[in-house]
Amino acid sequence: GSERTCCPINWVEYEGSCYWFSSSVRPWTEADKYCQLENAHLVVVTSRDEQNFLQRHMGPLNTWIGLTDQNGPWKWVDGTDYETGFQNWRPEQPDNWYGHGLGGGEDCAHFTTDGRWNDDVCRRPYRWVCETKLDKAN
């Protein structure tokens, strides 16, 4: 068959998915586009085990994930259901805070330095993680 059995070079395999960890920073929309160009998407976190795996690889870095409410409700970029799925927000988050002085609220989610999630201004440049299923990697 045409399915791949291993991840591309510089990608990390975990539980049937391949992950790529950026070493530079970009706004959420640019990070999202980058992943799409790699035939992938911003990481969608579906379990505590996956969360722990990602944390081990990231260290204390604010890092974009594929979760946004730019178009209304919170949605994962791959269509995974948000309401019934795994969530790991910092206490009192998300809060759509307007007090940052950067304009507007906060519509994009990221890993904070302790791994818990926060909503932040989408145009802030953070690191990011791309994910693709193992049989779609190229």
């Epitope: 722990n52 002085g101 950067l102 330095t113 791994g115």
Partner: antibody, heavy 121, light 107 residues
């Protein structure tokens, strides 16, 4: 009222060990990342180490990595800093500090009174 | 690591005067800056977070401003209790780094 109380400081010879402890009260300890920050005599402040809320990850400044170990006990609302292979440049007042969880912020919002560590022969 | 350059290192002013302390960062920290006050023999106290949000209980004569790589702390109508050392902190990325401090003395 948030309170952080350090203990365990003192005079120690170079190469020896010392363990600092911090007892926390007045807040939900298991929600917060905790840190140690030090201040050498007449000098500025220097972050030393952080342990995240559940103890799952720890972070250190380069100069103490491999010599210092930060840990926590959420059941007892305490955390500690085990300092091994101490050097004269580790001489400082060590502060236990709570890190905020507000948004993506990590600043230190509450500090203990500090405990002096002197490394000298 | 993000470098923090704080100025001046010391400052002498009279009661009622207004003073400013500057903090320059080696890269854009997107307002992730806090200011602390430390009195001799005491631990630091948080004055301002996120560049301009002052903490509960902090007198309104303290204010913070700035963006990008340039930030400042302003103290209006100095009072005797303001004599202290002031530090800035960036918490934009690890490791957190402090400015070298500004010692404020009252004439």
């Amino acid at each position: 009222e948030v309170q952080l109380v350090e203990s365990g400081g003192g005079l120690v010879q170079p190469g020896r060990s010392l363990k600092l402890s911090c007892a926390a009260s007045g807040f939900t300890f298991s929600d917060y990342n905790m840190a140690w920050v030090r201040q050498a005599p007449k000098k500025g402040l220097e972050w030393v180490a952080t342990i995240i809320y559940d103890g799952g990850s720890t972070y250190y400044r380069h100069s103490v990595k491999g010599r210092f170990t930060i840990s926590r006990d959420n059941a007892k609302s305490t955390h500690s800093l085990q300092m091994d292979s101490l050097r004269s440049e580790d001489t400082a007042t060590y502060y236990c500090a709570r890190q905020t969880y507000f948004g993506s912020r990590d600043y230190f919002d509450y500090w203990g009174q500090g405990v002096m560590v002197t490394v000298s022969s | 690591d993000i470098q923090m350059t704080q100025s001046p290192t010391s400052l002498s002013a009279s009661l009622g005067e207004t003073v400013s302390i500057e903090c320059l960062t080696s890269e854009d920290i997107y307002n992730n800056l806090a200011w602390y006050q430390q009195k001799p023999g005491k631990s630091p106290q948080l004055l301002i977070s996120y560049a301009s949000n002052f903490q509960d209980g902090v007198p309104s004569r303290f204010s913070g401003s700035g963006s990008g790589t340039q930030y400042s702390l302003k103290i209006n109508s100095l009072e005797s209790e303001d004599a202290a050392t002031y530090f800035c902190l960036q918490d934009s990325e690890y490791p957190p780094t402090f400015g070298g401090g500004t010692k404020l003395e009252l004439k």
